[in-house]
């Protein structure tokens, strides 16, 4: 007989990702005997909270907390009962709540208080509900991607941990209300607000990150709608044959469209707006979202924001993935190069409403928005962030890695699991029959 290592006990952690359009719950698990003070964390399960994001409950904070109950009840089942008390539970809110906090801080506080009240009713170790900064959202997304793709540390076949020689991956996240770009850089950032220094597994990383508020997919669509109402009287990015009635109050309610709000407008007025399937006018409309006129640094992405040249490979997730996946899967279009991505966007923008519905049978909701979404993704990557064909070749569009959703939630969890003490591994006398 000899000492045989018993399968280590599992620990669990829960993160509620309170996005602008909806909330998702992720339950993570890892062996209690963790290596280098960071656990080998993977996704155990997930749950989509029904209804809108918590920011949509500004007028009804208790509705925000009530919406979470179904997923929290699922968590009670998914995490073993004996682990409930030791399972940390976090809620992180992103750009939807950042916007609400800008326009109505009292409502934002009320929503967070309401969800806090509900989360404390559960037997988990609740550790707070807070709004993440754009910088945190970007960095934690970068940590998630590199952790899952084993760019920090890897378990070798000889039973040793080693640091892979390949570099880290950049991360690009397109949410509903903001978008983030984060990548490792060698030189110091000219704008200190865009630089984060990280120490992971004894290694030092200098990371550039920036979050653009109001450049998430939903807010971009709303801004384009406001622009179309102002300049055209029709929507060049919507398909011909698609017509809608718009309540002006809905268009100009967001802080992201405030700048486009007419001085004297009737918020209860309804306006009819039809699509025109015009890719060139749509491209012009999307271009108007980016300003390249001034840059106080040696180089900028857009809107006067410092950005070093994009370097290395990147993973693009969330709405980047959904947009490109629609082009590839639903429309059957190639998107391997920037040129192909632009051609695919033009192709979608040329489709009429009837043609789109025939190509994507069944789906009705949001189908009219894919032209604008594709055009925005193409422009953001090429003109905004400065990807050329060579650099774009290093971008992978991914939703999951190692059966775990790519997003900021795991990185957030990883950062916080360092606070969880590891149980010593159980040793038992036994016979190893292997």
């Amino acid at each position: 007989t000899r000492d045989v290592r018993e399968p280590p006990a599992l620990k669990y952690g829960i993160v509620l990702d309170a996005g602008s359009s909806h909330t998702s719950m992720f339950i993570y698990k890892w062996p209690a005997d963790k290596e280098n003070d960071t656990g080998i964390v993977g996704q155990h399960s997930s749950c989509d909270v029904p209804g809108g994001g918590i920011s949509s409950y500004a007028d009804n904070p208790s509705g925000a907390s009530q919406s979470l109950v179904g997923c929290l009840e699922q968590a009670l089942q998914d995490v073993p009962k004996e682990r409930h008390a030791g399972t940390p539970l976090y809620l992180g809110a992103t750009a939807g709540m950042r916007l609400l906090n800008l326009t109505n801080p009292e409502a934002s506080t009320s929503v967070l208080m309401a969800v806090t009240h509900t989360l404390t009713q559960y037997p988990f170790d609740f550790r707070g509900a807070r709004i993440l900064s754009g910088q945190e959202e970007g960095v934690f997304g970068w940590v998630t991607a590199n952790y899952l793709l084993e760019n920090f540390i890897k378990y070798g076949w000889v039973g040793r941990w080693f640091r892979p020689r390949k570099g880290t991956l950049g991360a690009m996240d397109l949410g509903g209300a903001s978008t983030q770009i984060t990548f490792e850089t060698t030189s110091p950032a000219e704008d200190r607000a865009s630089e984060v220094q990280l120490h992971l597994y004894g290694q030092h990383y200098r990371v550039y990150t920036h979050s653009f508020l109001c450049y998430g997919r939903d807010q971009v669509l709303q801004r384009l709608l406001a622009s179309a109402l102002q300049t055209h009287g029709f929507h060049p990015c919507w398909p011909r044959g698609f017509s809608t009635q718009v309540l002006l109050g809905d268009v100009y309610q967001s802080p992201c469209t405030m700048a486009q709000r007419p001085q004297n407008f009737n918020s209860s007025a309804r306006v009819s707006l039809s699509g025109s399937s015009d890719p060139h006018l749509c491209r012009d409309l999307v271009s108007g979202l980016f300003s390249f006129s001034s840059c106080p640094f040696s180089r900028c992405s857009f809107n006067g924001v410092f950005q070093p040249p994009v370097a290395g490979n990147f993973v693009a997730f969330s709405a980047f993935f959904y947009t490109v996946d629609f082009l590839r899967t639903s429309m059957g279009l190639p998107v391997a190069t920037l040129q192909q991505l632009e051609a695919a966007a033009v192709n979608v923008c040329n489709q009429t409403w009837a043609q789109l519905q025939a190509r994507v049978p069944g789906q009705r909701a949001r189908l009219a928005d894919y032209c604008a979404g594709a055009m925005f993704v193409q422009q953001l990557l090429s003109r905004g962030y400065g990807f050329d064909e060579r650099a774009f070749g290093g971008v992978i569009f991914q939703k999951k890695a190692a059966d775990t959703a790519v997003g900021w939630a795991l990185g957030y969890m990883l950062n916080l699991t360092n606070l969880i003490p590891a149980d010593p591994p159980g040793l038992r006398k036994g016979t190893d029959f292997s």
């Epitope: 602008s20 359009s21 909806h22 029904p50 209804g51 809108g52 994001g53 920011s55 949509s56 939807g96 916007l99 509903g176 209300a177 939903d218 807010q219 669509l221 709303q222 709608l225 011909r240 044959g241 698609f242 017509s243 809608t244 009635q245 718009v246 309540l247 809905d250 268009v251 309610q253 967001s254 009819s272 707006l273 039809s274 009429t352 409403w353 009837a354 519905q357 049978p361 069944g362 789906q363 009705r364 909701a365 949001r366 009219a368």
Partner: antibody, heavy 129, light 111 residues
Framework: QVQLQESGPGLVKPSQTLSLTCTVS?????????WNWIRQHPGKGLEWMGY???????NYNPSLKNRITISRDTSKNQFSLKLSSVTAADTAVYYC??????????????????????WGQGTTVTVSS | DTQMTQSPSSLSVSVGDRATITCKAS??????????MNWYQQKPGKAPKLLIY???NLESGVPSRFSGSGSGTDFTLTISSVQPEDFATYYC?????????FGGGTKLEIK
């Protein structure tokens, strides 16, 4: 005020083609809206049959696709339904209705909700020999 | 197609009572945080009338005693204090995917 009025024969023989017309007043059918046909079987719920858009595009319920045609006559501001090879199962009250996509905001993201807000009074069609 | 099941099929209430009608979809009618659910009212011999869209938004001109709630597959129409003119048949309808489908209806009757 937008108004819709259905017209057509109340009795159709099996295997024949059912033909109904909807006359729209107070709004041009080419200006906007999707012009729908919906039916209600006796004592049952509503069934969406299809529409012709302001742009003359059609969208039909797949369950009726091989039998249904919706067309329009812009000079009369009318749209019509033709349903071929009818059986007793097509006996119903037939409604025409104007629908559109309403832009609505929720959770800092807008979307489009298809609603039918103008309806005709309905006309009863019986399929019988 | 998404099947819509309403319950109860008929409901007897007195004037001033609260009435609750539920609608269950065979699959989620939500997409990216939006619920594509409408409610219609139909009086005998009349055409249906839109009451609520997007699960909870009241159509203009509809009295505030009507309210809608729910998301995913489960939705509710509530009349907080039933008035004589509310006795009618109510239908739910999803517009998340083609074809749009309606529930079988709930007949609200006087007790």
């Amino acid at each position: 005020q937008v108004q819709l009025q259905e017209s057509g024969p109340g009795l159709v023989k099996p295997s024949q083609t059912l033909s109904l017309t909807c006359t729209v007043s107070g709004y041009s059918i080419t200006s906007g809206y999707y012009w729908n046909w919906i039916r209600q079987h006796p004592g049952k719920g509503l069934e969406w049959m299809g529409y012709i858009s302001y742009d003359a595009d059609n969208n039909y319920n797949p369950s009726l696709k091989n039998r249904i045609t919706i067309s329009r006559d812009t000079s009369k501001n009318q749209f019509s339904l033709k349903l071929s090879s009818v059986t007793a199962a097509d006996t119903a009250v037939y409604y025409c209705a104007g629908g559109y996509y309403r832009y609505g905001l929720g959770s800092y993201s807008g979307s489009y909700y298809y609603v039918m807000d103008y309806w005709g009074q309905g006309t009863t069609v019986t399929v019988s020999s | 197609d998404t099947q819509m099941t309403q319950s109860p099929s008929s409901l007897s209430v007195s004037v001033g009572d609260r009435a609750t009608i539920t609608c269950k979809a065979s699959q989620s009618v939500d997409y990216e945080g939006h619920s594509y659910m409408n409610w219609y009212q139909q009086k005998p011999g009349k055409a249906p009338k839109l009451l609520i869209y997007a699960a909870s938004n009241l159509e203009s001109g509809v009295p505030s005693r009507f309210s809608g709630s729910g998301s995913g597959t489960d939705f509710t129409l509530t009349i907080s204090s039933v008035q004589p003119e509310d006795f009618a048949t109510y239908y739910c309808q999803q517009s998340n995917e083609d074809p749009p489908t309606f529930g079988g209806g709930t007949k609200l009757e006087i007790k």
